[in-house]
């Protein structure tokens, strides 16, 4: 659950985030699991720890292995594992499956290919894009921030897309590449204003103090592939990750599902070891897409333990 796969190519930069998160003020220690040897924090090292991030600048095949991160606060320690694999660069153009990030789909009207993991790096535009190793040229291709937009998508646009950028660390530049497949869906879909299925508006969810609780934000957005659709949680009207309560975590990915042919997204909020103060918070489920934003709210109430008499 708190283990994450990461991969990279030799002689490229690789930055890995600890799967366990906490306040920025919490210290994070990194270890190489096989030897239990501490990873240094001094930036002069090729491999060093920088808070929640583990940096390989650049990576070497020998760096492969499992790394342990321990988030330390005054009251608790939390452990996560990063399973890192560094591969040799391929001489030919084919990108093997094990180097591929998740596949994305596009349609004639909407096509966005995000550059995977780029948010972890200190990069500056322009981002370079390649399809099957060929640099993309022409007015149909637009590199915008961390994604590529393809105008008037055709079935021939399907393929493997690689983004290439430069990570800067203290004046030194390191190359990074990441590849994902793009598929083209030829379907007559449509998009609707988000419809939130869960939680119900003003829902009150019963929880037990000391136990774990899950809240699901679920919304549907139309039929077929949806673009710029998202569901997310807010805590007291602010971003979950910045609220500063590591017991309350939003799942990393959004689960896509289909309900009566409609495209829906779910986002789970996990509350570990529910405390009294959690009952005072407001949990907002936000669903948004090109049409607009909609919000539902849920509060927690204490579940009264039922006496079981024989």
């Amino acid at each position: 659950k708190f283990s994450k796969q990461s991969w990279g190519l030799e002689n490229e930069a690789l930055i890995v985030r600890c799967p366990r998160q906490g306040k920025p003020s919490y210290t994070v220690d990194w270890y190489y699991s096989q030897t239990n040897k501490s990873i240094p924090t001094q930036e002069r090292n090729r491999v060093f720890a920088s808070g929640q991030l583990l940096k390989f600048l650049p990576a070497a095949v020998a760096d492969s292995g499992i790394y342990t991160c321990i988030v330390r606060s005054p009251t608790f320690n939390r452990t996560g594992y990063a399973n890192v694999t560094i591969y040799k660069k391929q001489s030919d153009c084919n990108v093997p499956d094990y180097l591929m990030y998740s596949t994305v789909s596009g349609s004639e009207k909407n096509s966005k290919i995000y550059c995977p993991t780029i948010d972890l790096y200190n990069w500056t535009a322009p981002l370079e894009w390649f399809k099957n190793c060929q640099a993309l040229q022409g007015s149909r291709y637009r590199a915008h921030k961390s994604f590529l937009v393809i105008d008037n998508v055709m079935t021939e646009d399907a393929g493997d897309y690689t983004c290439k950028f430069i990570h800067n660390e203290n004046g030194a530049n390191y190359s990074v590449t990441a590849t994902r497949s793009f598929t083209v869906k030829d379907e007559q879909g449509f998009s609707l204003f988000p419809v939130i299925g869960a939680p119900a508006q003003n829902e009150i969810k019963e929880v037990e103090i000391g136990k774990n609780a899950n809240l699901t934000c679920s919304a549907c957005f139309g039929k077929g592939t949806q673009f710029l659709a998202a569901v997310l949680w807010q805590l007291n009207g602010t971003k979950i990750t910045d609220f500063g309560e590591p017991r309350i975590q939003q799942e990393e990915g959004q689960n896509q599902s289909f309900s009566n042919g409609l495209a829906c997204l779910d986002m789970v909020l996990r509350i570990a070891d529910v405390k009294e103060e959690d009952l005072l918070l407001q949990y907002d489920c936000l669903a948004l897409n090109l049409h607009g934003l909609r919000r539902h709210t849920v509060r927690l109430s204490r579940k009264n333990p039922i006496d079981h008499h024989s």
Epitope: G237, K239, D242, R295
Partner: antibody
Framework: EVQLLESGGGLVQPGGSLRLSCAAS????????MHWVRQAPGKGLEWVAV????????YYADSVKGRFTISRDNSKNTLYLQMNSLRAEDTAVYYC?????????WGQGTLVTVSS | DIQMTQSPSSLSASVGDRVTITCRAS??????LAWYQQKPGKAPKLLIH???KLQTGVPSRFSGSGSGTDFTLTISSLQPEDFATYYC?????????FGPGTKVDIK
């Protein structure tokens, strides 16, 4: 203390452009959605636009869609409103505001006058 | 889009009076409703959020009620500093919309 300070207002001719800025301080700017709201002289409040924490999601009132662009620079704790193709009916005091499921803090506003 | 209506559009009252302002949404908005007070030349000030919750620092004579489509702002005993214009706003769904306002002035 939460502070929002708008600037960039002034007199502009119809069809012209103006860029408003809002400097935020006293809170974690990048953790909040942010709004622009306007008020024409002697009239009520009109919501203009909202932007998500990282700027990836933006929504507009129909009256400004296609003409106004909301943006933000989290490294500078600043919110922007780029206003193009301005019309006389855009004359108003423009407020920048913080979202917490409602608007809980407002700036003092900056006056935009569109007139020939 | 969700339309917000307020009534009355204006009212005259005396210090000590109980004042009630209503706000109606054209469709259900749950409790995503806020009330603001605005005085001439000033920015609006948040009074009530989530339909019923008093914003920190706001006097307890202000209260909010309702959910769904019908909402009420009540001032239990009007004070001289309460003469102002009051707006409701829904934040359930974009475009977020304000009511046209209710002006409370001295009788």
């Amino acid at each position: 203390e939460v502070q929002l300070l708008e600037s960039g207002g002034g007199l502009v001719q119809p069809g012209g452009s103006l860029r408003l800025s809002c400097a935020a301080s006293g809170f974690a700017f990048s953790s909040h959605w942010m709004h622009w709201v306007r008020q024409a002289p002697g009239k009520g409040l009109e919501w203009v636009a909202v932007i998500s924490y990282d700027g990836s999601n933006k929504y507009y009132a129909d009256s400004v869609k296609g003409r106004f662009t909301i943006s933000r620079d989290n490294s500078k704790n600043t919110l922007y409103l780029q206003m193009n193709s301005l019309r006389a009916e855009d004359t108003a005091v423009y407020y920048c505001a913080r979202d917490r499921g409602m608007i809980d803090y407002w700036g003092q506003g900056t006056l935009v006058t569109v007139s020939s | 889009d969700i339309q917000m209506t307020q009534s009355p559009s204006s009212l005259s009252a005396s210090v000590g009076d109980r004042v009630t302002i209503t706000c109606r949404a054209s469709q259900g908005i749950g409790s995503w409703l806020a009330w603001y007070q605005q005085k001439p030349g000033k920015a609006p000030k948040l009074l009530i959020h989530a339909a019923t919750k008093l914003q920190t620092g706001v006097p307890s004579r202000f209260s909010g009620s309702g959910s769904g489509t019908d909402f009420t702002l009540t001032i239990s005993s009007l004070q001289p500093e309460d003469f102002a214009t009051y707006y409701c706003q829904q934040s359930y769904s974009t475009p977020f919309t304000f009511g046209p306002g209710t002006k409370v002035d001295i009788k």
